[in-house]
């Protein structure tokens, strides 16, 4: 196979850190990474069209140069350009999917809904999802013992700076109406903290982008609260006003609903408020 | 002031190869990607392939150029090479270096330009 | 094959005239506005005029506009001077970080 072939003409070895080197708080990078990016990235190449020609040797090359060697405190965005560049996908802008705080209902949704992307539908998304990963100063060996945590150690780290650099591009690409799924039953349903408050809401284009519709999800069969009236809805619709883009809110009561209604539109109990 | 400046073109048989340069000077070369562009006489302009070495070399290539061609980098020297294998006819043109900053902002475009040196298959 | 048209393939003009020249992507460009424009004198390089679509290049004059997004984009010259008689080429942003050249446009003196 490809990636057979990939690993033959390396012939890599990963090296474990010892483990009397420097411990973070976060777990440790994700056993067999490069096996894991690398057979991601081969998969994705083969069931999508678009990103065929995509050398999966030069995205993995392009993915450890942007941590390989380099202090796990000391990442920044220029150091995943490479990858960024390699990774570049036009998805349809006006059929993006941001969430926050609620991505498996984000990923079922576009799972069913064909033609809408989340960051994660994305060859660069796809590559990361779930995984951790950190190198350590002057040497190429990869850290599986432990990585920095964004509270305890640096928020300069590996993975969020990764997640923080396609996040940005991702909201940079969008256009006309951009759909954000949000979580109904935590305190915060935006949050100002969180990557789509700190990063994606910053990065739409007002030039591009006419509307930000926020779908806010409700977590008890009960609830029949509106949601969008709570403040930090009101929060966003004030940050996403400014930058002159109009906003608007629905109410998702029954996720379980919602999903089956996207499914098979044509179901007669479908009519009503979901 | 920012050159790029490309050799190495010349006349070769069908089959052989060519090592084309591209020496940098006036920025800091880390910092850009390097691109091959070629332009067949009065014809149009195609990508050939792309470099960038941060740390180790990134590098790319058009569908096309896949196999034949294929691009290097020595930092020391500030120059980046193309070299072409089993040439034919059809490559026969004008080979440009050009530089694309590295930056999401930026990159796409290629705001620097070699003068180009000439192959002839 | 991404392919990008360029119409009309040749243009004629006179100075003072306002000129339109179009490009068309078989595909979408990355970010739906990532097309440059480029000029091309004979037996030069090309000179980049425009960036993402409608950004202006460092010392290019601001008679040179463009626009359009996705697919569709055109570059306009609203008053053409004596040195704008030149060879002008788009140039779009795909999925891999690839790019792909239309075929140009050639703009001579009527």
């Known amino acids: 196979s490809g990636l057979n072939d990939i690993f033959e003409a390396q012939k890599i070895e990963w090296h474990e850190v010892p483990r009397w080197r420097q411990q973070w708080s976060g777990p440790g990078t994700t056993k067999r990474f490069p096996e894991t990016v690398l057979a991601r990235c081969v998969k994705y190449t083969e069931i999508h069209p678009e990103m065929r020609h995509v050398d999966c040797q030069s995205v993995w090359d392009a993915f450890k140069g942007a941590f390989i060697s380099k202090h796990p405190c000391n990442i920044t965005e220029e150091d995943y350009q490479p990858l960024m560049k390699l990774g570049t996908q036009t998805v349809p802008c006006n059929k993006i999917l941001l969430w926050s705080r609620i991505k498996d209902l984000a990923h079922q949704f576009t799972q069913v809904q064909r033609d809408m992307f989340t960051l994660e539908d994305t060859l660069l998304g796809y590559l990361a999802d779930d995984l951790t990963w950190c190198g350590e100063f002057n040497t190429s060996k990869i850290n599986y013992q432990s990585c920095p945590d964004w509270r305890k150690d640096c928020s300069n780290n590996p993975v969020s700076v990764f997640w923080k650099t396609v996040s940005r591009r991702f909201a940079e690409a969008a256009c006309d109406v951009v759909h954000v799924m949000l979580n109904g039953s935590r305190s915060k349903i935006f949050d100002k903290n969180s990557t789509f408050g700190s990063v994606e809401v910053h990065n739409l284009q007002p030039e591009k982008v006419q509307t930000l519709e926020a779908w806010v999800i409700h977590g008890g069969r009960e609830d029949s609260r509106d949601l969008c009236q709570d403040p930090t809805i009101k929060e966003l619709e004030s940050i996403i006003s400014k930058r002159n883009i109009q906003f608007s809110c629905k109410n998702i009561y029954r996720p379980d609903k919602f999903l089956q209604c996207v499914k098979n539109p044509e179901d007669s109990s479908c009519t009503s408020e979901i | 002031e920012v050159q790029l400046l490309e050799s190495g073109g010349g006349l070769v048989q069908p089959g052989g190869s060519l090592r084309l340069s591209c020496a940098a000077s006036g920025f800091s070369f880390n910092n850009y990607w390097i691109i091959w562009i070629r332009q067949a006489p009065g014809k149009g302009l195609e990508w050939v392939a792309a470099i960038y070495s941060p740390s180790g070399d990134i590098k790319y290539y058009a569908d096309w150029a896949k196999g034949r061609f294929t691009v290097s980098k020595d930092n020391s020297k500030n120059t980046v090479y193309l070299q072409m294998n089993s040439l034919r006819a059809e490559d026969t043109a004008v080979y440009y270096c050009?530089?694309?900053?590295?930056?999401?902002?930026?990159?796409?475009?290629?705001?620097?330009w070699g003068q180009g040196t000439l192959v002839t298959v | 094959d991404i392919q990008l048209t360029q119409s009309p393939s040749t243009l004629s003009a006179s100075v003072g005239d306002r000129v339109t020249i179009t490009c068309r992507s078989s595909q979408s460009v990355y970010g739906h506005n990532w097309l440059a424009w480029y000029q091309q004198k004979p037996g030069k390089a090309p000179k980049l005029l425009m960036y993402r679509a409608s950004n202006l290049a460092s010392g290019v004059p601001s008679r040179f506009s463009g626009s359009g997004s996705g697919t569709e984009f055109t570059l306009t010259i609203s008053s053409v001077q004596p040195d704008d008689f030149a060879t002008y080429y788009c140039q779009g942003y795909y999925s891999g970080g690839s790019y792909a050249f239309g075929g140009g446009t050639k703009v001579e003196i009527k």
């Open positions: 050009a530089r694309e900053l590295a930056g999401s902002s930026y990159e796409g475009y290629f705001e620097s």
